[in-house]
Interface confidence: low
């Protein structure tokens, strides 16, 4: 058993039929010695008396809020949560496996630049009685600070008969050094509590590997005289690291016909302009990627040829 | 060239070669991004590589103040990786494919390090750790890790030279 936060405890249980469970001793936080009784949740049934209560925790029915009282007055509470271990593996019932970029990916994170700010998100089909707490650090043995905000519900989607909820959190490395070569990964730890079930999820990454720039901005077309060619120009996204002479992007320019089957013309360039042939009903799209490190491409910025 | 007196390197040449290094490092092991090599244990094998750290003056401000600190660190790393790519980790079994970019990568590391340091002037270089993996699969894993680490190192070096070429060239 360990303390998650004040008055909230996690009991780790091997989860199999007829498992013996864990013996837990609860102590009433009071100077009183006599006349103390214990109850569980809303029940008025007295579970025991005395300053301590010993219980055998085997299943969710044994978890919950234990309260000690004296003469009708509440003295203190202890909330017991269960963390299940099945076949040596901690349960992952609360969050959905996103399966990208590989199986057992519960947390996904992205950064728009090298400032040390990043966003992580996760999915669940659970809509109520759900809380998340997020901690992060750079490195684990001698951790350096990363400050995370509160996790918030950021999207709701309908998937077949099910509703899916997306939660996200923003974190910022306290002492970020955008120009350095990272040697220790960022660690992200999410505590998830659904009713009386506790689970934890972790992700480990370098900022450089989760970079995904915003799309290029101010995408414009300038027809060239007496020609089907146009000059496409764009700018670095506002959110990208500066100076751009140091944090450089490379770009992919694509001409795409109305039909998805039509051949796509693609040009790669380090400049912020390119000359392409604009076909009727086609559109021109541009996306960006770090010039020197092959992390994710941005989403496309598009403009119609007409 | 970065000479003992501390004059500027050939920023544009360094920029071109370092950008080529980035391309080669990724073509040498493009899929490495989809493998979480940090789960594979064996940390000490890549812990000793020289990283371009926060205080090495490789940020835009540090380069403007005095680029020598940074260039020295980059040179140190280039020599280190050049030695690793020439060691039995890459020359031993399983053999690299004949058209593997590792050979080109090795040559380019040497080329850039020589651009930074003319003959007769020696910056101190870091000792290469003695890594002699016994099993071919260990050697394969070590190659992935070294290339992954090299990708990060040359990205920073390329940024430095691009910025230098744009803002510090005479």
């Amino acid at each position: 058993i360990w303390e998650l936060k004040k008055d909230v405890y996690v009991v780790e249980l091997d989860w199999y039929p007829d498992a013996p469970g864990e013996m837990v001793v609860l102590t009433c936080d009071t100077p009183e010695e006599d006349g103390i009784t214990w109850t569980l949740d809303q029940s008025s049934e007295v579970l025991g008396s005395g300053k301590t209560l010993t219980i055998q925790v085997k299943e969710f029915g044994d978890a919950g809020q234990y309260t000690c009282h004296k003469g009708g007055e509440v003295l203190s509470h202890s909330l017991l949560l269960l963390h299940k271990k099945e076949d040596g593996i901690w349960s992952t019932d609360i969050l959905k496996d996103q399966k990208e970029p590989k199986n057992k990916t519960f947390l996904r994170c992205e950064a728009k630049n090298y400032s040390g700010r990043f966003t992580c998100w996760w999915l669940t089909t659970i809509s109520t009685d759900l809380t998340f707490s997020v901690k992060s650090s750079r490195g684990s043995s001698d951790p350096q600070g990363v400050t995370c905000g509160a996790a918030t519900l950021s999207a709701e989607r309908v998937r077949g008969d099910n509703k899916e909820y997306e939660y996200s959190v923003e974190c910022q490395e306290d002492s970020a050094c955008p120009a350095a070569e990272e040697s220790l990964p960022i660690e992200v730890m999410v505590d998830a509590v659904h009713k009386l079930k506790y689970e934890n999820y972790t992700s480990s990454f370098f900022i450089r590997d989760i970079i995904k720039p915003d799309p290029p901005k101010n995408l414009q077309l300038k027809p060239l005289k007496n020609s089907r060619q146009v000059e496409v120009s764009w700018e670095y996204p506002d959110t990208w690291s500066t100076p751009h002479s140091y944090f450089s992007l490379t770009f992919c320019v694509q001409v795409q016909g109305k039909s998805k089957r039509e051949k796509k013309d693609r040009v790669f360039t380090d400049k912020t302009s390119a000359t392409v042939i604009c076909r009727k009903n086609a559109s021109i799209s541009v996306r960006a990627q770090d010039r020197y490190y092959s992390s994710s491409w941005s989403e496309w910025a598009s403009v119609p040829c007409s | 060239r970065a000479v003992p007196g501390g004059s500027s390197p050939a920023w544009t040449q360094c920029q071109q070669l370092s950008q080529k290094l980035c391309t080669l490092a990724w073509s040498a092991h493009p899929l490495v991004g989809h493998m979480d090599l940090r789960e594979e244990g064996d940390e000490e094998t890549t812990n000793d590589v020289p990283h371009i750290q926060c205080g090495d003056g490789c940020d835009p401000q540090g380069l403007r103040d005095n680029s020598q600190f940074c260039l020295q660190r980059i040179h140190q790393g280039l020599i280190f990786y050049e030695k690793l790519l020439g060691s039995d980790i890459f020359t031993g079994e399983p053999s690299l494919l004949p058209d593997s970019p590792v050979g080109q990568l090795h040559a380019s590391l040497l080329g850039l390090s020589q651009l930074l340091q003319p003959e007769g002037h020696h910056w101190e270089t870091q000792q290469i750790p003695s890594l002699s993996p016994s099993q071919p699969w260990q050697r394969l894993l070590l190659r992935f890790k070294i290339l992954r680490s090299l990708q990060a190192f040359v990205a920073v070096a390329a940024r430095v030279f691009a910025h230098g070429a744009a803002t510090l060239s005479p």
Epitope: D174, S175, C177 | Q53, C54, G55, D56, G57, Q61, G62, D65, N66, F69, R73
Partner: antibody, heavy 121, light 112 residues
């Protein structure tokens, strides 16, 4: 516990030199940038110099540039400030301070008690 | 003349809220550099109170908070206490001077 102890202050004539030391304990000295900050009698704080965690980068205030040299010996967990060509306006309490990060920019989270330098003829 | 401008003094009664301003320029606070705040009692070394514009080191009460807008920063103390009477300094980095810079300091007087 984390501690910085300055020494080497005293009374010195204008034009002369003085070397201040700062002994660090209770933290990994070689992982942090270190500063010297001074405070003239009845005045505010004035930043003097900083040195990066490994000694490779050093920066100085314009008022001391060319006269003062900051250095460190990581094997001895000691920071130094060599002060040459001292002037009356260098009279102050000199503090050494630990940066929260490897380089400057994250705040000075540990300070010594200060050592007094008086420059007077 | 400090690069960062702070008012020489502010005062407030116990329990009140007081704010300290720190005005810079676009080569320091306005360039996006973090602002740090220090508290100094007479005859004592300064103590880091707020770092990275709005983060409190452990042991600093949550009565102290920092914020930044454009080229200015401010420190706020809520529920003012007699023991808060001290000098308060802001500090940041100036990219033009390539130097760390302090404000001139503000003396806080707790009335009463």
């Amino acid at each position: 516990q984390v501690q910085l102890v300055e020494s080497g202050g005293g009374l010195v004539k204008p034009g002369r030199s003085l070397r201040l030391s700062c002994a660090a304990s209770g933290f990994t000295f070689s992982s942090y940038a270190m500063h010297w900050v001074r405070q003239a009698p009845g005045k505010g704080l004035e930043w003097v110099a900083v040195i990066s965690y490994d000694g490779s980068n050093k920066y100085y205030a314009d008022s001391v540039k060319g006269r003062f040299t900051i250095s460190r010996d990581n094997s001895k967990n000691t920071l130094y400030l060599q002060m040459n060509s001292l002037r009356a306006e260098d009279t102050a309490v000199y503090y050494c301070a630990k940066e929260k990060g490897m380089v400057r920019g994250y705040g000075m989270d540990v300070w010594g008690q200060g050592t007094t330098v008086t420059v007077s003829s | 003349q400090s690069v960062l401008t702070q008012p020489p003094s502010v005062s407030g009664a116990p329990g009140q809220r007081v704010t300290f301003s720190c005005t810079g320029s676009d080569s320091n606070i306005g360039a996006g550099y973090d602002v740090h705040w220090y508290q100094q009692f007479p005859g004592r070394a300064p103590k880091l109170l707020i770092y990275g514009t709005n983060n409190r080191p452990s042991g600093v009460p949550d009565r102290f908070s920092g914020s930044k807008s454009g080229a200015s920063a401010s420190l706020a103390i809520t529920g003012l206490q007699v023991e808060d009477e001290a000098d308060y300094y802001c500090q940041t980095f100036d990219t033009r001077l390539i130097a760390s810079v302090f404000g001139g300091g503000t003396q806080l007087t707790v009335l009463g």
